[in-house]
Interface confidence: low
């Protein structure tokens, strides 16, 4: 890879739709990694400091950002549900964390071309009640 | 997975931190549905997945867009996919 | 901008009637779904029954086959006509449109619905 063109990802949690908490009685959240070169990155939910796999779907497969482009940018979004009564209490934090890897294992950087640190992204959001 | 009760349901979730970033989740539709990409290159909808709530027995599909432009709304972010009509629930305004 | 304005509320008895109105006006052309939302003192805002432009209505359970959902897109009006009312109906009632672009939601300032002997 182009060192010039590596990029970390930009990463943003969005919260669950009163509707569909009112709908389902169920809580989603979306974590969003964007505008990442390469496609090297592993994400993770993590609830009240520790890591979780049940209620977790993540795409199994970065897109394009601008699929015409051999270099394009790359995005990945992933999703957590959990009951909402889980996603209204206050107290529960919920933080996405994605890993990126600045350059493949096949890579090789000089001396003067520092080799990109892994770098951890996170965004994150708190329960919220009614009001 | 078969989808025991399917209840397809567009919702518009907002960024923790900017209210004004939104994505529109596609969830709860059954295995049948097969969900399209944009024709709009500035629209980003991701593959369907499955997502099993291991301590409520419970599975559902679900499908990501999201998009920069001003004129993307969640209520035909779908709209390519052959999903039924009035999925999109909006959310009332916080009366917080 | 689309400005929604409610009326019709107020004071009945439980069994009896009365029609909402939302009169709207601004950039109608925008809205896919009308709907009309309710909250009652400490509870959340919640859904009480919606109608698209292509004519399709949903309905809270708790509403269903009681309360009606329509427009006369002449009088650029919804309405909200309400029979056979509870105590538990009593709440604000608020109009809300959704729109395909940005904002995406608008909402009038509500009306008062209370129903008691």
């Known amino acids: 890879e182009d060192l010039n063109k590596v990029f970390p990802p930009e990463v943003a949690v969005f919260e669950p739709s009163e509707a569909e908490i009112s709908h389902t009685q169920k809580a989603t959240l979306v974590c969003l990694a964007t505008g990442f070169f390469p496609d090297h990155v592993e994400l993770s939910w993590w609830v009240n400091g520790k890591e979780v796999h049940s209620g977790v779907s993540t795409d199994p497969q970065p897109l394009k950002e601008q699929p015409a482009l051999n270099d394009s940018r790359y995005c990945l979004s992933s999703r957590l549900r959990v009951s909402a009564t889980f996603w209204q209490n206050p107290r529960n934090h919920f933080r996405c964390q994605v890993q990126f890897y600045g350059l493949s294992e096949n890579d090789e950087w000089t001396q003067d071309r520092a080799k990109p640190v892994t770098q951890i992204v996170s965004a994150e959001a708190w329960g919220r009640a009614d009001c | 997975p078969n989808i025991q009760n399917p209840d397809p349901a567009v919702y518009q979730l907002r960024d923790s931190k900017s209210s004004d970033k939104s994505v529109c989740l596609f969830t709860d539709f059954d295995s049948q549905t097969n969900v399209s990409q944009s024709k709009d290159s500035d629209v980003y909808i991701t593959d369907k997945t499955v997502l099993d709530m291991r301590s409520m027995d419970f599975k559902s599909n679900s499908a990501v867009a999201w998009s920069n432009k001003s004129d993307f709304a969640c209520a035909n972010a779908f709209n390519n996919s052959i999903i039924p009509e009035d999925t999109f629930f909006p959310s009332p305004e916080s009366s917080c | 901008e689309v400005q929604l304005v409610e009326s019709g509320g107020g004071l009945v008895q439980p069994g009896g009637s009365l029609r909402l109105s939302c009169i709207t006006s601004?950039?109608?052309?925008?809205?896919?779904?009308w709907g009309w939302y309710r909250q009652a003192p400490g509870k959340q805002r919640e859904l009480v029954a919606s109608?698209?432009?292509?004519?399709?209505?949903n309905y809270a359970d708790s509403v269903k086959g009681r309360f009606t959902i329509s427009e006369d897109s002449a009088k650029n009006t919804v309405y909200l006509q309400m029979n056979s009312l509870k105590p538990e109906d009593t709440a604000v009632y608020f109009c809300?449109?959704?729109?395909?672009?940005?904002?995406?939601?608008?909402w009038g300032r509500g009306t008062q619905v209370t129903v008691s002997s």
């Open positions: 109608l698209t432009i292509g004519g399709a209505t």
């Open positions: 601004g950039e109608t052309f925008k809205i896919n779904i």
């Open positions: 809300n449109a959704k729109s395909r672009i940005y904002p995406y939601d608008y």
